[in-house]
Interface confidence: low
Amino acid sequence: MAVTACQGLGFVVSLIGIAGIIAATCMDQWSTQDLYNNPVTAVFNYQGLWRSCVRESSGFTECRGYFTLLGLPAMLQAVRALMIVGIVLGAIGLLVSIFALKCIRIGSMEDSAKANMTLTSGIMFIVSGLCAIAGVSVFANMLVTNFWMSTANMYTGMGGMVQTVQTRYTFGAALFVGWVAGGLTLIGGVMMCIACRGLAPEETNYKAVSYHASGHSVAYKPGGFKASTGFGSNTKNKKIYDGGARTEDEVQSYPSKHDYV
């Protein structure tokens, strides 16, 4: 009963998490204009992975997609890739876990098969959650870097011309949605992995068999042999993301009309 509950809860938590990852990926508010120095602004900018938006104080809002792949910063492409990989893995994991649920009977599927499927989906959820967390964290790091770079620009000026009003960007709602969703997917995956251990048949009952060796009669009685699940070999660590150093021109800098490609 506890196993079914753990598996069911893991599935539900992962489902919510993946829905959140999808929502975060689609959201426009990954970065929002920092209003600390200018709380009463006529125009409010915010940006997502796919498009950039501007909202006027009157409510007039206009969004514009990023039209090119080649012109976009490598970091933004990496974040997009991580989020999409997370969604794809999560979706496959959900599909697999539906068939693995103990409460759903599909033909004469054995518990060992369900255990395997539960573990597979659990691992997929864990990797999916990690991808989402990594993607959001990379973007957040990019924002922090740009925030301090643009703060420095506000005071030092660029090319001898001091820019009196610099649009700086801070964390948008999508980042928090992504972090929470990634965490939930990760937790759901862990719960599925825990449930898998309970689903795996603990005892394998063998019928008594008599083996007749030459001149000897050895009777093998049913014993307490542990069933080997064979899961131990499935634990290779795949490298998800290499957050290595980037050159300065690869860091995404938002606050200019020249960024619109």
Epitope: T41, A42, V43, N45, S52, V54, E56, F60, E62, R64, G65, F67, Q163, V165, Q166, T167, P255, S256, K257, H258, Y260, V261
Partner: antibody, heavy 118, light 112 residues
Framework: QVQLVQSGAEVKKPGASVKVSCRVS????????MYWVRQAPGKGLEWMGG????????IYAQKFQGRVTMTEDTSTGTAYMELSSLRSEDTAIYYC???????????WGQGTPVTVSS | DIVMTQTPLSSPVTLGQPASISCRSS???????????LSWLQQRPGQPPRLLIY???KRFSGVPDRFSGSGAGTDFTLKISRVEAEDVGVYYC?????????FGQGTKVEIK
């Protein structure tokens, strides 16, 4: 509210140059796409040029190519349009218009009348 | 360049009556991003133009709901459901799909 305030009326002689300014308040000039449009007396609107956010550069209408220069000074939040080799047919009201980085005419300056007369 | 053609060039209307202005472009105004960047501007006598409608049918902030835009591809229409005295002026259609930006010749709306 975003506001565009243009410089005052100008009277110029043929062959001279005129530099019209457009000061942006309420928002960062560097984030706006500025266009310049003129209107001859009793005539319609004519696009002179402006910033193309897709190419990241200023584009000028063929008719004004070589005669017009559009610049921006982000330190003062002012855009400039300079038209050289003035002729009598350049007598018009010159407007700056901004598009908030998009393709629409959200805000307009009040217009700068330029008279070219000998 | 995209040529914008407006009809009629003059439209005398009675107060409270509807008015309609047509605008045709020489080629499709559908941008590669899927949007159609066709705007309508109003210019009252002695004033700079102001944006009424953008992206064919979206009313800009502060524009009364008696103004509406419609159309697709190359044919577009601006409708004023009930003309008021303050609606007198010249109306321009303009495209933002391609550079150079181009305008219609303008339609003068006046009270009969």
């Amino acid at each position: 509210q975003v506001q565009l305030v243009q410089s005052g009326a100008e009277v110029k002689k043929p062959g001279a140059s005129v530099k019209v300014s457009c000061r942006v308040s309420g928002y960062t000039l560097s984030a706006l796409s500025m266009y310049w449009v003129r209107q001859a007396p009793g005539k319609g609107l004519e696009w002179m040029g402006g910033f193309d956010p897709e190419d990241g550069k200023t584009i000028y209408a063929q008719k004004f190519q070589g005669r017009v220069t559009m610049t921006e000074d982000t330190s003062t939040g002012t855009a400039y349009m300079e038209l050289s080799s003035l002729r009598s047919e350049d007598t018009a009201i010159y407007y700056c218009a901004t598009t908030l980085r998009y393709f629409d005419w959200n805000y307009w300056g009040q217009g700068t009348p330029v008279t070219v007369s000998s | 360049d995209i040529v914008m053609t407006q009809t009629p060039l003059s439209s005398p209307v009675t107060l409270g009556q509807p008015a309609s202005i047509s605008c045709r472009s020489s080629q499709s105004l559908v941008h590669s991003d899927g949007n159609t960047y066709l705007s309508w501007l109003q210019q009252r006598p002695g004033q700079p133009p102001r944006l009424l409608i953008y992206k064919v049918s979206k009313r800009f902030s502060g524009v009364p709901d008696r103004f509406s835009g419609s159309g697709a591809g190359t044919d577009f229409t601006l409708k004023i459901s009930r003309v008021e005295a303050e609606d007198v002026g010249v109306y321009y259609c303009t495209q933002g799909t391609q550079f150079p930006r181009t305008f219609g010749q303008g339609t003068k709306v006046e009270i009969k």
